[in-house]
């Protein structure tokens, strides 16, 4: 049974599927939010360029006690090749300005939709 269980486990998720699922989660967050997302918590904004996924995770991982973004944090970790822990800012090259989590998620969502349309899945 143990061996058969191995056959049943899913293989790697295609990058296009993973990106689509992340976009869907961010859409879900933005649409279902009645109160301000994470009650106004501020995070470092990021450059939406190379290393964006790790930078996004490094910024969001510091927010605690906000269940609405826990799934997003987990999903972003799948896109980032290295382990990210709170207080780590190696991918946040410039700590320029802080924005509310709600704005951060909106900005990230717009950019990810653009990447998806352009077929940039990694």
């Amino acid at each position: 049974l143990t061996c058969l269980g191995g056959f049943a486990s899913p293989g790697p998720v295609p990058p296009s599927t993973a990106l689509r699922e992340l976009i869907e989660e961010l859409v879900n967050i933005t649409q279902n939010q009645k109160a301000p997302l994470c009650n106004g918590s501020m995070v470092w904004s990021i450059n939406l360029t190379a290393g964006m996924y790790c930078a996004a995770l490094e910024s969001l991982i510091n927010v605690s006690g906000c269940s609405a973004i826990e799934k997003t944090q987990r999903m972003l970790s799948g896109f980032c090749p290295h382990k990210v822990s709170a207080g780590q800012f190696s991918s946040l090259h410039v700590r320029d300005t802080k924005i509310e989590v709600a704005q951060f998620v909106k900005d990230l969502l717009l950019h990810l939709k653009k990447l998806f349309r352009e077929g940039q899945f990694n």
């Epitope: 994470c38 918590s41 501020m42 510091n62 927010v63 006690g65």
Partner: nanobody, 116 residues
Framework: EVQLLESGGGLVQPGGSLRLSCAAS????????MDWVRQAPGKGLEWVSA????????YYADSVKGRFTISRDNSKNTLYLQMNSLRAEDTAVYYC?????????WGQGTLVTVSS
């Protein structure tokens, strides 16, 4: 329980100065970065400045760079914001915040009004 109490706001003329203070309690102040955030009448929250746990690392919004100075005294569990060359657009309620915490844990704020 995190408690933050801001003070030092008031009415000041354009070009004037104010120093805001924030007394912190209920957490190990010296271990956390801190933020100043403001909310102008009828507007959303705007991040103003941040400071690292030791006070060595400081960060500013472009709108206040060169005019505002953030500092902290870990022995007194107090955060400061020195505001110089104040402008009408700096009018807002100023909040201090333990970094990454929701506004439920912020102070009640202190009102700064810049007007002639």
């Amino acid at each position: 329980e995190v408690q933050l109490l801001e003070s030092g706001g008031g009415l000041v003329q354009p070009g004037g100065s104010l120093r805001l203070s924030c007394a912190a309690s209920g957490f190990t102040f010296k271990s956390y970065g801190m933020d100043w955030v403001r909310q102008a009448p009828g507007k959303g929250l705007e991040w103003v400045s941040a400071i690292g746990p030791t006070g060595r690392d400081t960060y500013y919004a472009d709108s206040v760079k060169g005019r505002f100075t953030i500092s902290r005294d870990n022995s007194k569990n107090t955060l400061y914001l020195q505001m110089n060359s104040l402008r009408a657009e700096d009018t807002a309620v100023y909040y201090c915040a333990k970094e990454y915490t929701p506004f439920d844990y912020w102070g009640q704020g202190t009102l700064v009004t810049v007007s002639s």
